[in-house]
Amino acid sequence: EVEKTACPSGKKAREIDESLIFYKKWELEACVDAALLATQMDRVNAIPFTYEQLDVLKHKLDELYPQGYPESVIQHLGYLFLKMSPEDIRKWNVTSLETLKALLEVNKGHEMSPQVATLIDRFVKGRGQLDKDTLDTLTAFYPGYLCSLSPEELSSVPPSSIWAVRPQDLDTCDPRQLDVLYPKARLAFQNMNGSEYFVKIQSFLGGAPTEDLKALSQQNVSMDLATFMKLRTDAVLPLTVAEVQKLLGPHVEGLKAEERHRPVRDWILRQRQDDLDTLGLGLQGGIPNGYLVLDLSMQEALS
Protein backbone atom coordinates (compact mmCIF):
# COMPACT_ATOMS: atom_id res chain seq x y z
CA GLU A 1 0.00 0.00 0.00
CA VAL A 2 1.45 3.35 -1.07
CA GLU A 3 1.27 6.25 1.38
CA LYS A 4 -1.00 9.13 0.37
CA THR A 5 1.19 12.16 -0.41
CA ALA A 6 0.63 15.29 -2.50
CA CYS A 7 1.95 15.28 -6.05
CA PRO A 8 5.10 17.42 -6.38
CA SER A 9 4.74 20.59 -8.44
CA GLY A 10 5.02 20.00 -12.19
CA LYS A 11 4.76 16.21 -11.93
CA LYS A 12 1.03 15.78 -12.47
CA ALA A 13 0.64 13.31 -15.35
CA ARG A 14 -1.20 14.80 -18.32
CA GLU A 15 -1.06 11.55 -20.26
CA ILE A 16 0.10 7.98 -19.80
CA ASP A 17 3.56 7.86 -21.40
CA GLU A 18 7.12 6.53 -21.00
CA SER A 19 8.10 9.32 -18.59
CA LEU A 20 6.06 7.53 -15.91
CA ILE A 21 8.67 4.77 -15.56
CA PHE A 22 10.83 7.40 -13.84
CA TYR A 23 8.16 8.00 -11.16
CA LYS A 24 8.57 6.45 -7.74
CA LYS A 25 5.63 4.37 -6.53
CA TRP A 26 4.32 7.16 -4.30
CA GLU A 27 4.57 9.61 -7.21
CA LEU A 28 2.51 7.32 -9.43
CA GLU A 29 -0.09 7.10 -6.69
CA ALA A 30 -0.15 10.87 -6.17
CA CYS A 31 0.32 12.15 -9.71
CA VAL A 32 -1.59 9.80 -12.00
CA ASP A 33 -5.31 10.42 -12.15
CA ALA A 34 -7.25 7.13 -12.08
CA ALA A 35 -9.77 8.34 -14.68
CA LEU A 36 -6.93 9.30 -17.03
CA LEU A 37 -5.38 5.87 -16.49
CA ALA A 38 -8.70 4.18 -17.29
CA THR A 39 -9.10 6.02 -20.59
CA GLN A 40 -5.49 5.38 -21.64
CA MET A 41 -5.02 1.79 -20.50
CA ASP A 42 -3.94 0.76 -23.99
CA ARG A 43 -0.81 2.90 -23.52
CA VAL A 44 0.17 1.02 -20.36
CA ASN A 45 0.72 -2.03 -22.57
CA ALA A 46 3.50 -0.24 -24.44
CA ILE A 47 5.40 1.06 -21.40
CA PRO A 48 7.98 -1.16 -19.64
CA PHE A 49 6.86 -0.62 -16.05
CA THR A 50 8.19 -2.75 -13.21
CA TYR A 51 5.81 -5.16 -11.50
CA GLU A 52 5.76 -2.87 -8.44
CA GLN A 53 4.70 0.10 -10.56
CA LEU A 54 1.95 -2.00 -12.14
CA ASP A 55 0.70 -2.87 -8.65
CA VAL A 56 0.22 0.85 -7.99
CA LEU A 57 -1.70 1.28 -11.26
CA LYS A 58 -3.94 -1.69 -10.43
CA HIS A 59 -4.61 -0.20 -7.00
CA LYS A 60 -5.73 3.04 -8.64
CA LEU A 61 -8.13 1.18 -10.93
CA ASP A 62 -9.50 -0.83 -7.98
CA GLU A 63 -10.28 2.41 -6.14
CA LEU A 64 -11.95 3.91 -9.20
CA TYR A 65 -14.04 0.80 -9.94
CA PRO A 66 -14.85 -0.97 -6.65
CA GLN A 67 -17.82 -2.74 -8.30
CA GLY A 68 -15.68 -4.14 -11.13
CA TYR A 69 -13.91 -2.73 -14.18
CA PRO A 70 -15.84 -1.70 -17.31
CA GLU A 71 -15.10 -3.66 -20.48
CA SER A 72 -13.31 -0.67 -22.03
CA VAL A 73 -10.65 -1.06 -19.32
CA ILE A 74 -10.70 -4.87 -19.20
CA GLN A 75 -9.87 -5.13 -22.91
CA HIS A 76 -6.58 -3.28 -22.36
CA LEU A 77 -5.47 -4.81 -19.06
CA GLY A 78 -2.64 -6.78 -20.63
CA TYR A 79 -0.33 -8.14 -17.94
CA LEU A 80 -2.52 -6.62 -15.21
CA PHE A 81 -5.06 -9.33 -15.98
CA LEU A 82 -2.66 -11.84 -14.41
CA LYS A 83 -2.66 -9.72 -11.24
CA MET A 84 -6.42 -10.04 -10.88
CA SER A 85 -7.97 -12.50 -8.47
CA PRO A 86 -10.90 -14.72 -9.50
CA GLU A 87 -12.97 -12.59 -7.09
CA ASP A 88 -12.05 -9.45 -9.08
CA ILE A 89 -13.00 -11.17 -12.36
CA ARG A 90 -16.38 -12.33 -11.04
CA LYS A 91 -17.36 -8.66 -10.85
CA TRP A 92 -16.81 -8.20 -14.57
CA ASN A 93 -19.27 -8.33 -17.43
CA VAL A 94 -17.26 -9.39 -20.49
CA THR A 95 -19.33 -9.64 -23.67
CA SER A 96 -16.85 -9.00 -26.49
CA LEU A 97 -14.93 -11.88 -28.04
CA GLU A 98 -12.14 -9.39 -28.79
CA THR A 99 -11.76 -8.71 -25.07
CA LEU A 100 -11.63 -12.42 -24.34
CA LYS A 101 -8.97 -12.98 -27.02
CA ALA A 102 -6.85 -10.07 -25.77
CA LEU A 103 -6.77 -11.46 -22.24
CA LEU A 104 -6.13 -15.04 -23.34
CA GLU A 105 -3.17 -13.79 -25.39
CA VAL A 106 -1.52 -12.47 -22.22
CA ASN A 107 -1.62 -15.96 -20.69
CA LYS A 108 -0.67 -17.74 -23.93
CA GLY A 109 1.72 -20.65 -23.52
CA HIS A 110 0.83 -21.14 -19.86
CA GLU A 111 -1.56 -23.57 -18.21
CA MET A 112 -5.12 -22.39 -17.73
CA SER A 113 -4.90 -20.26 -14.59
CA PRO A 114 -7.75 -19.73 -12.10
CA GLN A 115 -8.08 -16.22 -13.55
CA VAL A 116 -8.54 -17.57 -17.07
CA ALA A 117 -10.97 -20.27 -15.95
CA THR A 118 -13.07 -17.64 -14.15
CA LEU A 119 -12.96 -15.29 -17.14
CA ILE A 120 -14.13 -18.03 -19.52
CA ASP A 121 -16.89 -19.06 -17.14
CA ARG A 122 -18.14 -15.45 -16.88
CA PHE A 123 -17.96 -15.01 -20.64
CA VAL A 124 -19.79 -18.22 -21.55
CA LYS A 125 -22.49 -17.66 -18.91
CA GLY A 126 -22.97 -14.13 -20.24
CA ARG A 127 -23.49 -15.48 -23.75
CA GLY A 128 -25.88 -18.19 -22.61
CA GLN A 129 -24.28 -20.87 -24.77
CA LEU A 130 -20.93 -21.95 -26.13
CA ASP A 131 -21.27 -20.62 -29.68
CA LYS A 132 -18.95 -21.55 -32.54
CA ASP A 133 -16.77 -18.42 -32.45
CA THR A 134 -16.23 -18.72 -28.71
CA LEU A 135 -15.43 -22.42 -28.94
CA ASP A 136 -13.08 -21.73 -31.85
CA THR A 137 -11.24 -19.16 -29.76
CA LEU A 138 -11.07 -21.23 -26.59
CA THR A 139 -9.87 -24.43 -28.23
CA ALA A 140 -7.24 -22.46 -30.18
CA PHE A 141 -5.74 -21.28 -26.88
CA TYR A 142 -6.52 -24.39 -24.82
CA PRO A 143 -6.95 -27.57 -26.91
CA GLY A 144 -8.15 -29.46 -23.82
CA TYR A 145 -10.83 -26.90 -22.98
CA LEU A 146 -13.80 -28.90 -24.23
CA CYS A 147 -12.83 -31.93 -22.15
CA SER A 148 -12.62 -29.79 -19.01
CA LEU A 149 -16.38 -29.19 -19.17
CA SER A 150 -18.90 -31.37 -17.40
CA PRO A 151 -21.48 -33.31 -19.47
CA GLU A 152 -24.07 -30.82 -18.20
CA GLU A 153 -22.02 -27.86 -19.46
CA LEU A 154 -21.39 -29.62 -22.77
CA SER A 155 -25.12 -30.00 -23.29
CA SER A 156 -25.27 -26.21 -23.94
CA VAL A 157 -22.93 -26.57 -26.95
CA PRO A 158 -25.03 -26.11 -30.10
CA PRO A 159 -24.36 -28.63 -32.92
CA SER A 160 -23.16 -25.81 -35.17
CA SER A 161 -20.23 -25.20 -32.78
CA ILE A 162 -18.95 -28.74 -33.35
CA TRP A 163 -17.44 -27.59 -36.65
CA ALA A 164 -14.82 -25.72 -34.62
CA VAL A 165 -13.63 -28.87 -32.83
CA ARG A 166 -10.33 -30.45 -33.89
CA PRO A 167 -9.39 -34.08 -33.11
CA GLN A 168 -6.78 -32.98 -30.54
CA ASP A 169 -9.44 -31.02 -28.67
CA LEU A 170 -11.05 -34.34 -27.69
CA ASP A 171 -7.90 -36.17 -26.61
CA THR A 172 -8.66 -35.97 -22.89
CA CYS A 173 -12.45 -36.39 -23.07
CA ASP A 174 -13.92 -39.31 -21.15
CA PRO A 175 -16.82 -41.49 -22.40
CA ARG A 176 -19.44 -39.46 -20.51
CA GLN A 177 -18.37 -36.31 -22.35
CA LEU A 178 -18.28 -38.06 -25.72
CA ASP A 179 -21.77 -39.43 -25.06
CA VAL A 180 -22.97 -35.80 -25.03
CA LEU A 181 -20.83 -34.59 -27.93
CA TYR A 182 -21.39 -37.48 -30.35
CA PRO A 183 -25.11 -36.84 -31.08
CA LYS A 184 -24.30 -33.16 -31.67
CA ALA A 185 -21.51 -34.11 -34.09
CA ARG A 186 -23.79 -36.57 -35.88
CA LEU A 187 -26.32 -33.79 -36.35
CA ALA A 188 -23.69 -31.25 -37.40
CA PHE A 189 -22.15 -33.50 -40.07
CA GLN A 190 -25.31 -35.26 -41.27
CA ASN A 191 -25.27 -33.71 -44.74
CA MET A 192 -21.74 -34.83 -45.60
CA ASN A 193 -21.01 -37.77 -47.86
CA GLY A 194 -19.64 -41.08 -46.54
CA SER A 195 -15.86 -40.62 -46.52
CA GLU A 196 -15.98 -36.94 -45.55
CA TYR A 197 -18.50 -37.71 -42.82
CA PHE A 198 -16.25 -40.40 -41.35
CA VAL A 199 -13.22 -38.08 -41.26
CA LYS A 200 -15.24 -35.53 -39.27
CA ILE A 201 -17.12 -37.93 -36.97
CA GLN A 202 -14.14 -40.18 -36.21
CA SER A 203 -12.92 -38.22 -33.16
CA PHE A 204 -16.39 -38.34 -31.59
CA LEU A 205 -17.03 -42.07 -32.04
CA GLY A 206 -16.24 -42.81 -28.39
CA GLY A 207 -19.85 -41.79 -27.84
CA ALA A 208 -21.39 -43.79 -30.69
CA PRO A 209 -24.07 -46.48 -30.07
CA THR A 210 -23.98 -49.96 -31.62
CA GLU A 211 -26.45 -49.17 -34.39
CA ASP A 212 -24.26 -46.33 -35.68
CA LEU A 213 -21.20 -48.56 -35.67
CA LYS A 214 -23.15 -51.19 -37.61
CA ALA A 215 -24.13 -48.55 -40.15
CA LEU A 216 -20.52 -47.40 -40.50
CA SER A 217 -19.42 -50.99 -41.11
CA GLN A 218 -21.43 -50.93 -44.33
CA GLN A 219 -19.55 -47.90 -45.66
CA ASN A 220 -15.97 -49.15 -46.18
CA VAL A 221 -14.59 -46.65 -43.68
CA SER A 222 -11.41 -48.55 -42.66
CA MET A 223 -11.43 -47.39 -39.04
CA ASP A 224 -7.97 -47.41 -37.47
CA LEU A 225 -7.28 -49.40 -34.30
CA ALA A 226 -6.66 -46.29 -32.18
CA THR A 227 -10.24 -45.15 -32.91
CA PHE A 228 -11.65 -48.65 -32.38
CA MET A 229 -9.96 -48.91 -28.96
CA LYS A 230 -11.73 -45.72 -27.85
CA LEU A 231 -15.21 -47.02 -28.70
CA ARG A 232 -17.66 -47.76 -25.90
CA THR A 233 -17.32 -51.39 -24.83
CA ASP A 234 -21.09 -51.77 -24.61
CA ALA A 235 -21.39 -50.50 -28.20
CA VAL A 236 -18.74 -52.90 -29.54
CA LEU A 237 -19.92 -56.10 -27.82
CA PRO A 238 -23.00 -56.72 -30.04
CA LEU A 239 -21.02 -56.33 -33.29
CA THR A 240 -20.49 -59.53 -35.25
CA VAL A 241 -17.10 -60.66 -36.49
CA ALA A 242 -18.16 -59.79 -40.04
CA GLU A 243 -19.19 -56.27 -38.95
CA VAL A 244 -15.93 -55.63 -37.16
CA GLN A 245 -14.02 -56.92 -40.17
CA LYS A 246 -15.90 -54.52 -42.44
CA LEU A 247 -15.53 -51.66 -39.97
CA LEU A 248 -11.75 -52.03 -39.69
CA GLY A 249 -11.01 -53.08 -43.24
CA PRO A 250 -7.24 -53.62 -43.63
CA HIS A 251 -6.72 -52.56 -40.01
CA VAL A 252 -8.43 -55.73 -38.75
CA GLU A 253 -5.00 -57.34 -38.40
CA GLY A 254 -4.33 -54.98 -35.50
CA LEU A 255 -6.87 -56.84 -33.34
CA LYS A 256 -4.24 -59.48 -32.52
CA ALA A 257 -1.98 -56.95 -30.80
CA GLU A 258 -4.94 -55.65 -28.76
CA GLU A 259 -6.61 -58.96 -27.88
CA ARG A 260 -5.85 -58.56 -24.15
CA HIS A 261 -7.19 -55.00 -23.96
CA ARG A 262 -10.71 -53.61 -23.77
CA PRO A 263 -12.90 -53.44 -25.75
CA VAL A 264 -11.26 -56.13 -27.95
CA ARG A 265 -10.85 -58.59 -25.08
CA ASP A 266 -14.49 -58.36 -24.03
CA TRP A 267 -15.68 -58.51 -27.63
CA ILE A 268 -13.65 -61.71 -28.29
CA LEU A 269 -15.32 -63.38 -25.27
CA ARG A 270 -18.72 -62.74 -26.89
CA GLN A 271 -17.86 -64.19 -30.32
CA ARG A 272 -18.00 -67.81 -31.51
CA GLN A 273 -14.50 -69.17 -31.87
CA ASP A 274 -15.47 -70.47 -35.32
CA ASP A 275 -16.25 -66.93 -36.43
CA LEU A 276 -13.03 -65.55 -34.93
CA ASP A 277 -11.05 -68.22 -36.78
CA THR A 278 -12.34 -66.91 -40.10
CA LEU A 279 -10.22 -63.79 -39.54
CA GLY A 280 -7.08 -65.91 -39.60
CA LEU A 281 -5.45 -63.83 -36.87
CA GLY A 282 -5.16 -66.53 -34.21
CA LEU A 283 -7.54 -64.74 -31.83
CA GLN A 284 -8.37 -67.03 -28.89
CA GLY A 285 -10.96 -66.91 -26.13
CA GLY A 286 -14.17 -67.08 -28.12
CA ILE A 287 -17.16 -69.30 -27.28
CA PRO A 288 -16.23 -72.91 -28.09
CA ASN A 289 -18.10 -74.61 -30.91
CA GLY A 290 -21.27 -76.38 -29.83
CA TYR A 291 -21.98 -74.11 -26.87
CA LEU A 292 -25.35 -72.37 -26.65
CA VAL A 293 -25.29 -68.67 -25.81
CA LEU A 294 -28.18 -67.36 -23.75
CA ASP A 295 -28.73 -63.63 -23.72
CA LEU A 296 -29.90 -63.21 -20.12
CA SER A 297 -30.69 -59.55 -20.57
CA MET A 298 -33.20 -60.47 -23.29
CA GLN A 299 -34.68 -63.21 -21.06
CA GLU A 300 -35.18 -60.72 -18.22
CA ALA A 301 -36.87 -58.29 -20.56
CA LEU A 302 -39.32 -60.96 -21.72
CA SER A 303 -40.23 -62.05 -18.18
Epitope: N45, A46, F49, G78
Partner: nanobody, 115 residues
Framework: LQLVESGGGLVQPGGSLRLSCAAS????????IGWFRQAPGKEREGVSS????????NYADSVKGRFTVSRDNAKHTVYLQMNSLKPEDTAVYYC??????????MGQGTSVTAP
Protein backbone atom coordinates in the same frame (compact mmCIF):
# COMPACT_ATOMS: atom_id res chain seq x y z
CA LEU B 1 9.06 -14.91 -19.36
CA GLN B 2 12.54 -14.13 -18.11
CA LEU B 3 15.08 -11.44 -18.98
CA VAL B 4 18.79 -11.86 -18.20
CA GLU B 5 21.06 -8.92 -17.39
CA SER B 6 24.86 -9.10 -17.62
CA GLY B 7 27.91 -6.83 -17.74
CA GLY B 8 27.87 -5.51 -14.17
CA GLY B 9 30.99 -5.29 -12.04
CA LEU B 10 33.35 -3.09 -10.05
CA VAL B 11 34.51 0.10 -11.79
CA GLN B 12 36.37 3.21 -10.67
CA PRO B 13 34.43 6.49 -10.52
CA GLY B 14 34.65 8.13 -13.95
CA GLY B 15 34.90 4.71 -15.60
CA SER B 16 32.51 2.97 -18.00
CA LEU B 17 30.46 -0.24 -18.18
CA ARG B 18 28.10 -1.71 -20.75
CA LEU B 19 25.16 -3.71 -19.46
CA SER B 20 23.27 -6.18 -21.65
CA CYS B 21 19.69 -7.38 -21.44
CA ALA B 22 18.75 -10.56 -23.30
CA ALA B 23 15.67 -12.78 -23.31
CA SER B 24 15.56 -16.35 -22.07
CA UNK B 25 13.20 -18.56 -24.07
CA UNK B 26 11.71 -15.85 -26.30
CA UNK B 27 12.86 -13.00 -28.53
CA UNK B 28 13.13 -9.38 -27.37
CA UNK B 29 12.62 -7.84 -30.80
CA UNK B 30 9.07 -6.59 -30.26
CA UNK B 31 9.56 -5.66 -26.60
CA UNK B 32 9.94 -2.11 -25.31
CA ILE B 33 12.63 -2.23 -22.61
CA GLY B 34 13.19 -0.17 -19.48
CA TRP B 35 16.32 -0.11 -17.35
CA PHE B 36 15.87 0.33 -13.60
CA ARG B 37 18.20 0.34 -10.62
CA GLN B 38 17.93 -0.22 -6.91
CA ALA B 39 20.55 1.03 -4.48
CA PRO B 40 20.83 -0.64 -1.05
CA GLY B 41 17.97 0.45 1.19
CA LYS B 42 16.32 2.51 -1.54
CA GLU B 43 13.32 2.11 -3.82
CA ARG B 44 13.84 0.87 -7.36
CA GLU B 45 14.01 3.77 -9.83
CA GLY B 46 13.77 4.14 -13.60
CA VAL B 47 16.96 4.90 -15.50
CA SER B 48 16.09 4.73 -19.19
CA SER B 49 13.73 3.21 -21.74
CA UNK B 50 13.79 2.27 -25.42
CA UNK B 51 10.91 1.45 -27.76
CA UNK B 52 10.66 -1.86 -29.61
CA UNK B 53 11.93 -0.23 -32.82
CA UNK B 54 14.71 1.65 -31.04
CA UNK B 55 13.37 4.92 -32.43
CA UNK B 56 12.39 6.39 -29.07
CA UNK B 57 14.57 6.64 -25.95
CA ASN B 58 14.08 8.31 -22.57
CA TYR B 59 16.37 8.99 -19.62
CA ALA B 60 16.08 9.95 -15.97
CA ASP B 61 17.51 13.41 -15.28
CA SER B 62 20.24 11.91 -13.08
CA VAL B 63 21.82 9.98 -15.98
CA LYS B 64 21.15 12.22 -19.00
CA GLY B 65 24.30 12.81 -21.04
CA ARG B 66 26.15 9.94 -19.32
CA PHE B 67 24.05 6.85 -20.10
CA THR B 68 22.94 5.65 -23.54
CA VAL B 69 20.37 2.95 -24.23
CA SER B 70 20.43 1.06 -27.53
CA ARG B 71 19.33 -2.21 -29.05
CA ASP B 72 20.62 -4.70 -31.59
CA ASN B 73 17.63 -6.69 -32.79
CA ALA B 74 19.89 -8.93 -34.85
CA LYS B 75 21.49 -10.01 -31.56
CA HIS B 76 18.15 -9.81 -29.70
CA THR B 77 19.85 -7.67 -27.05
CA VAL B 78 19.34 -4.26 -25.43
CA TYR B 79 22.34 -2.37 -24.03
CA LEU B 80 22.90 0.31 -21.43
CA GLN B 81 26.20 2.11 -21.98
CA MET B 82 27.19 3.85 -18.74
CA ASN B 83 29.95 6.47 -18.87
CA SER B 84 31.37 8.84 -16.25
CA LEU B 85 30.12 6.58 -13.48
CA LYS B 86 29.64 8.12 -10.03
CA PRO B 87 29.46 6.49 -6.59
CA GLU B 88 25.72 7.24 -6.56
CA ASP B 89 25.32 4.98 -9.61
CA THR B 90 26.15 1.99 -7.40
CA ALA B 91 23.11 -0.29 -7.48
CA VAL B 92 21.65 -3.49 -8.86
CA TYR B 93 20.49 -2.79 -12.42
CA TYR B 94 17.42 -4.51 -13.86
CA CYS B 95 15.74 -4.57 -17.25
CA UNK B 96 11.99 -4.91 -17.69
CA UNK B 97 10.14 -5.43 -20.94
CA UNK B 98 6.67 -5.23 -22.40
CA UNK B 99 5.63 -6.91 -25.66
CA UNK B 100 2.53 -7.73 -27.66
CA UNK B 101 -0.75 -7.87 -25.71
CA UNK B 102 1.01 -6.39 -22.67
CA UNK B 103 3.06 -9.53 -21.99
CA UNK B 104 5.80 -8.62 -19.52
CA UNK B 105 9.18 -9.88 -18.41
CA MET B 106 11.78 -8.81 -15.90
CA GLY B 107 15.29 -9.88 -14.97
CA GLN B 108 17.05 -10.75 -11.71
CA GLY B 109 19.54 -7.89 -11.98
CA THR B 110 23.29 -7.32 -12.36
CA SER B 111 25.33 -5.46 -9.76
CA VAL B 112 27.28 -2.28 -10.52
CA THR B 113 29.71 -0.87 -7.94
CA ALA B 114 31.50 2.47 -8.37
CA PRO B 115 32.99 3.06 -4.89
Amino acid sequence: LQLVESGGGLVQPGGSLRLSCAASGFTLDNYAIGWFRQAPGKEREGVSSISSSGGSTNYADSVKGRFTVSRDNAKHTVYLQMNSLKPEDTAVYYCAGVGDYGRRAMGQGTSVTAP
